[in-house]
Interface confidence: low
């Protein structure tokens, strides 16, 4: 073992270094002192450190550690924060488009219903937005309210337009009859199934991203213990007390110290891994009725089909309701001409064709791939921080917390540290309360994510599948079938391209009335949106 270098006779180097940490030199000895009052940098001989300097070093060491931790998590934090914002905005855009598609359908096909229909549709999609953001709204109630509100208007405006004003107090009866008589057939139930499943998954997806931000924020702002501060001080600053200004800590020693300091944080690792894998499972399942983009953008077609269903049964229905709601029919229902095909106005559905299309789905998968590169983030933190702070390469000629050594030996270092500080003790103390809380939150979200993504027949799908709601797929082409069956059906090719509302914002007020019946070609809407470089750091 090489002899310790002679101490700086004047503590000059130490004074100039410490001056940068703490203006004023009153705490720095002018010449080496015995240092018997030191508690961390226990001297083997004369030292250039005082107790006050030690305290300042500890404070600085903890601050350094906090900064290193924050810079370590910066990229991950940015990734999740930006994607949470991006997806929240994207979902809002999808909801807005879905509302406008639905309003356009009413304006083009049922202009006599529009004032009230717009109001009900607006309320429904407002509730959809609130639900996605976590509001305690029941999806079935939302759908029921939409159809409960629509039916009296459909009945009084379309089916029995000659009702006198005195008979218009039957609205409450009509709302009740709507369910009793299943006037819309199974369409409300179909919509409930699709909307509740897709929104539930969307909501948990956003919740999970927001919790991801909370996890990073929590670990980002951890206050390290005094014990950790002492270890860091010994590693980073105690060499200065011996005048060893250029010596770097041994890499192996740094890892031991970091593992001690990070013992609590590293406990998050298991749940963080599970979080990313559970989120991936959820994302992999977000298609068809588990994809809100697919479901909401097809709602206008399903609602259109449901109204056609009412119209097809209007004769019998009018008689039944006449008795049920105790009002006399003013005139027989005359089946007006309601075209089977949906009018789609090109102005309402302006399209931006883009070569590199990007769907919400592909964006989700891209996020998961990026998140998976951070799957070992917490277990790798000690090593990451050591690699981003000054350490000696190959563990040669380095500082082991007590002295300059030619080669670092973990066993020797630990034996030498026993009197000063027990690393094992630090690890056994367990995580900070804030870490325990965030672990509990991760456990909870992982539980929810697992519940959402049961691969072999999700628990509550069984009966619904048996009722045939998901039968009748559109075949093997790329297009996803949306809405019910029949002539009113529409294909939305490759789904909405989201985020940058480049070419249009649907404005129903600008949409002309019933111009002309759409051709089959018009019915194949390609709604392409490009992400562009609006959020360039993620591109």
């Amino acid at each position: 073992q090489p002899p310790p270098p002679p101490p700086d006779a004047t503590c000059h180097q130490v004074r100039s270094f410490f001056q940068r940490l703490q203006p004023g030199l009153k705490w720095v000895p002018e010449t080496p002192v015995p240092g018997s009052d030191l508690q961390v940098c226990l001297p083997k001989g004369p030292t250039c450190c005082s107790r006050k300097m030690e305290e300042k070093y500890q404070l600085t060491a903890r601050l350094n550690m906090e900064q290193l931790l924050q810079s370590a998590s910066m990229e991950l934090k940015f990734l999740i924060i930006q994607n949470a914002a991006v997806f929240q905005e994207a979902f809002e855009i999808v909801v807005r488009h879905a509302k406008n598609y639905t309003n356009a359908m009413f304006k083009n096909n049922y202009p006599s219903l529009t004032p009230q229909a717009f109001e009900f549709v607006g309320e429904f999609f407002t509730d959809v937005s609130l639900y996605i953001l976590g509001s305690d709204i029941n999806v079935d109630d939302m759908v029921n309210e939409l159809f409960d509100s629509l039916f009296p208007v459909i009945y009084t405006q379309l089916m029995n337009p000659g009702l006198p004003d005195s008979a218009l107090d039957i609205n409450e009866c009509l709302r009740g009859a709507r369910r009793d008589l299943k006037v819309f057939g199974n369409f409300p139930k179909l919509i409930m199934t699709q909307v509740s499943k897709s929104l539930q998954v969307t909501r948990i997806f956003l919740q999970a991203l927001n919790l991801g931000i909370e996890v990073i924020n929590t670990t980002d702002h951890l206050k390290f213990s005094k014990d950790c501060g002492r270890m860091l001080t010994r590693m980073w600053y105690c060499s200065y007390c011996q005048g060893l200004m250029m010596v770097k800590p041994c890499g192996g020693y740094c890892n031991v110290v970091m593992q001690g300091c990070m013992a609590g944080v590293v406990e998050i690792d298991k749940y963080w891994r599970e979080y990313i894998l559970s989120l991936e499972e959820l994302v992999n399942g977000m298609y068809r009725i588990y994809d809100m983009e697919n479901v909401l953008l097809g709602l206008f077609s399903t609602i259109h089909d449901s109204i056609q269903y009412v119209q097809k049964n209007a004769g019998k229905l009018t008689t039944t309701i006449g008795k049920l709601c105790a009002h006399s029919q003013q005139r027989q229902y005359r089946s007006a001409y309601y075209p089977e095909d949906l009018f789609i106005d090109k102005k309402v559905l302006k399209v931006a064709h883009v070569e590199h299309e990007e769907t919400l789905s592909s964006r989700r998968r891209e996020l998961i791939q990026k998140l998976k590169s951070f799957i070992s983030f917490y277990s790798a933190l000690p090593g990451y921080i050591c690699s981003h702070s000054p350490v000696a390469e190959n563990d040669t000629l380095c500082w082991n917390g007590q002295e300059l050594v030619e080669r670092y030996s973990q066993k020797a270092a630990r034996n030498g540290m026993k009197n000063q500080f027990n690393l094992h003790e630090l690890k056994m103390k367990g995580p900070e309360p804030v870490v325990s809380q965030i672990i509990d939150k991760l456990k909870h979200i992982n539980q929810l994510l697992r519940t959402m993504s049961m691969p072999k027949g999700r628990v509550l799908d069984k009966n619904l599948d048996e009722e045939g709601f998901e039968s009748g797929d559109c075949g093997d082409d790329e297009d996803e079938c949306i809405g019910g069956s029949g002539d009113g059906m529409i294909k939305v090719k490759n789904q909405l391209r989201f985020l940058a509302e480049l070419a249009y914002d649907l404005d129903v007020d600008d949409a002309p009335g019933n111009s002309q019946q759409a051709t089959p070609k018009d019915n194949e809407i390609s709604t392409f949106h490009n992400l562009g470089n609006v959020h360039s750091p993620l591109k």
Epitope: D136, V139, D140, S196, K443, L448, R450, T451, N463, L464
Partner: antibody, heavy 117, light 108 residues
């Protein structure tokens, strides 16, 4: 505090039906799924099925398919389990249990159903 | 429907450790929950997700799960621990919750 209060004991004849209720309080009824579990005298626990009080959708154990019906009344925060075509081997204590995607954190006190001619 | 096998009974002296096993094919890949049931009472959750303990459950109760066996361990057994214990898993192949056969713990 969370409570699940079940209806009282029932004695039924073979071939009859029984409807057991489970009234929930102390939490948002529609936020938690409810399961039904039964236990024959001196026997183990047996899972019967699940109901989502929010939408009313259900999933039943294969063994009880066609004989069991689970329903809910959100206005009274009550779930019901009806078992038809009763036989003597259906004599058991029937429990409702609150579920949130994992373990059962709260159970009802149990309802003894005796099937005897 | 897969069977979760538990020993019918386990006897243990006060202050000693009781271990209750729950055997099932590749049970380590599933989350296991454990319930305690005293005579005439509803079951009570004692361990969930293999090893987590609900608030109010003493630290003496712990769980582990790997391979084909999950284990509930009760250390420093007390007279009040005398009860039936059941393990439970979600079986994805049948979309059923499955309970173990149950173990009666007797404190000598």
């Amino acid at each position: 505090q969370v409570q699940l209060v079940q209806s009282g004991a029932e004695v039924k004849k073979p071939g009859a039906s029984v409807k057991v209720s489970c009234k929930a309080s102390g939490y948002t009824f529609t936020s938690y799924y409810m399961h039904w579990v039964r236990q024959a005298p001196g026997q183990g626990l047996e899972w019967m099925g699940i109901i989502n009080p929010s939408g009313g959708s259900t999933s039943y154990a294969q063994k009880f398919q066609g004989r069991v019906t689970m329903t809910r009344d959100t206005s009274t925060s009550t779930v019901y389990m009806e078992l038809s075509s009763l036989r003597s081997e259906d004599t058991a204590v029937y429990y409702c249990a609150r579920w949130h995607g994992g373990p059962y954190d709260y159970w009802g006190q149990g309802t003894l159903v005796t099937v005897s001619s | 429907q897969p069977v979760l096998t538990q020993p019918p009974s386990v006897s243990v002296a006060p202050g000693k450790t009781a271990r209750i096993t729950c055997g099932g094919n590749n049970i380590g890949s599933k989350s296991v929950h454990w319930y305690q049931q005293k005579p005439g009472q509803a079951p009570v959750l004692v361990i969930y997700y293999d090893s987590d303990r609900p608030s109010g459950i003493p630290e003496r109760f712990s769980g582990s799960n790997s391979g084909n066996t999950a284990t509930l361990t009760i250390s420093r057994v007390e007279a009040g621990d005398e009860a039936d214990y059941y393990c439970q898993v979600w079986d994805s192949s049948s979309d059923h919750y499955v309970f173990g056969t149950g173990t009666k713990v007797t404190v000598l």
